[in-house]
Interface confidence: low
């Protein structure tokens, strides 16, 4: 399926729209808000009861080339005594983002949008108990 | 820009960096992943730092619907089911890339936009703010 033509029922296509070949779209990859500096609550990944580590994945044919992924450090959660409590579960929280993928076919280059699932951090949950019959 | 390895047999005119503007196929790869977090997991209810999910809709953006997490409590839920204020529920935030219609209302012309979303919440030991 194609990208949903969001709001086409009420959008009047302006005359100023650039001409685009069929089956494709024009994408400016100069990022809006590129320079916003954001830092979450200090050391959130190590202060959490479901702590996590970060790893950076690098792919030169992807834009952005760097994607940071989190991995939960424990199966259980850290209790007030600093010990792992396996009656609770550390689970990953994930979020989709878009990337641009560059594909080489011989000497020609094409670009493809791709959805990537990023693990952002972890949270501590009460486990779902599956009773075995 | 990003430097990429080049096929040595190709002409030198190929740019090693991503160009500023590209023509992109309208089909999105991996686009059928579940985008409604309420359906994809119930972590938001089972977490010791539970959160509510708020629908953020913008027809000038793709995806047009993004779910924002808001922590339900300042503290965390303890083993007795009560809120423990010795711990803090804090949102986990992530910068994501979306498409913004540019110029506005154009069906097939977009610009990448970086936005900050709260994805869920986690329970942390607080940083104590000492009052002078």
């Amino acid at each position: 399926r194609k990208i949903p033509k969001v709001g086409h029922t009420f959008f009047q296509k302006p005359e100023s729209c650039p001409p685009v070949p069929g089956g494709s779209m024009k994408l400016d990859i100069g990022i809006i808000n590129e320079n916003q500096r954001v830092s979450m609550s200090r050391n959130i990944e190590s202060r959490s009861t479901s702590p996590w580590n970060y790893t950076v994945t690098w792919d030169p044919n992807r834009y952005p080339s760097e994607v940071v992924q989190a991995q939960c450090r424990n199966l259980g959660c850290i209790n007030a005594q600093g010990k792992e409590d396996i009656s609770m579960n550390s689970v990953p929280i994930q979020q989709e983002t878009l990337v641009v993928r560059r594909k080489h076919q011989g000497c020609s280059v094409s670009f493809q949008l791709e959805k990537v699932l990023v693990t952002v951090g972890c949270t501590c949950v009460t486990p779902v108990i599956h009773h075995v019959q | 820009g990003i430097t990429i390895p080049r096929n040595p047999g190709c002409p030198n005119s190929e740019d090693k960096n991503f160009p500023r503007t590209v023509m992109v196929n309208l089909n999105i790869h991996n686009r059928n992943t579940n985008t409604n977090p309420k359906r994809s997991s119930d972590y938001y209810n089972r977490s010791t730092s539970p959160w509510n999910l708020h629908r953020n809709e913008d027809p000038e953006r793709y995806p047009s619907v993004i779910w924002e997490a808001k922590c339900r409590h300042l503290g965390c839920i303890n083993a007795d089911g009560n809120v423990d204020y010795h711990m803090n529920s804090v949102p986990i935030q992530q910068e994501i890339l979306v498409l913004r219609r540019e110029p506005p209302h154009c069906p097939n012309s977009f610009r990448l936009e970086k936005i900050l979303v709260s994805v869920g919440c986690t329970c942390v030991t607080p940083i104590v703010h000492h009052v002078a």
């Epitope: 500096r37 954001v38 830092s39 979450m40 609550s41 200090r42 | 708020h54 808001k70 922590c71 300042l74 503290g75 803090n88 529920s89 804090v90 949102p91 935030q93 607080p126 940083i127 703010h129």
Partner: nanobody, 124 residues
Framework: EVQLVESGGGLVQPGGSQRLSCAAS????????MGWYRQAPGKQRELVAL???????DYADSVKGRFTISRDNSKNTVYLQMNSLRAEDTAVYYC??????????????????WGQGTLVTVSS
Amino acid sequence: EVQLVESGGGLVQPGGSQRLSCAASGTIVNIHVMGWYRQAPGKQRELVALIFSGGSADYADSVKGRFTISRDNSKNTVYLQMNSLRAEDTAVYYCAAEIGYYSGGTYYSSEAHWGQGTLVTVSS
């Protein structure tokens, strides 16, 4: 740093009304949640009401229909209008907020902050 300063506490008759205010100051960028908690003598601190950045509010069952929380985003202030007060509403009322702020050039989001508390006594 961020400070929360409450005002409006005091002695009020049963059935009467009182309005509490809490102002957040500091280099604040955004306030995700502001609200009120209370602690009666010998009891645990409990939620009274919270108001989220989108304007939606949550209330404790014990105050629904009697208390109204509101906020003035331009002043970084939250209010608690308390009507039909009862003796069991006597407590120290604490303002609480989850705030994003700048400090030393870094943006910090969502640290929980508490005010010093203001005493509300409902008695004849």
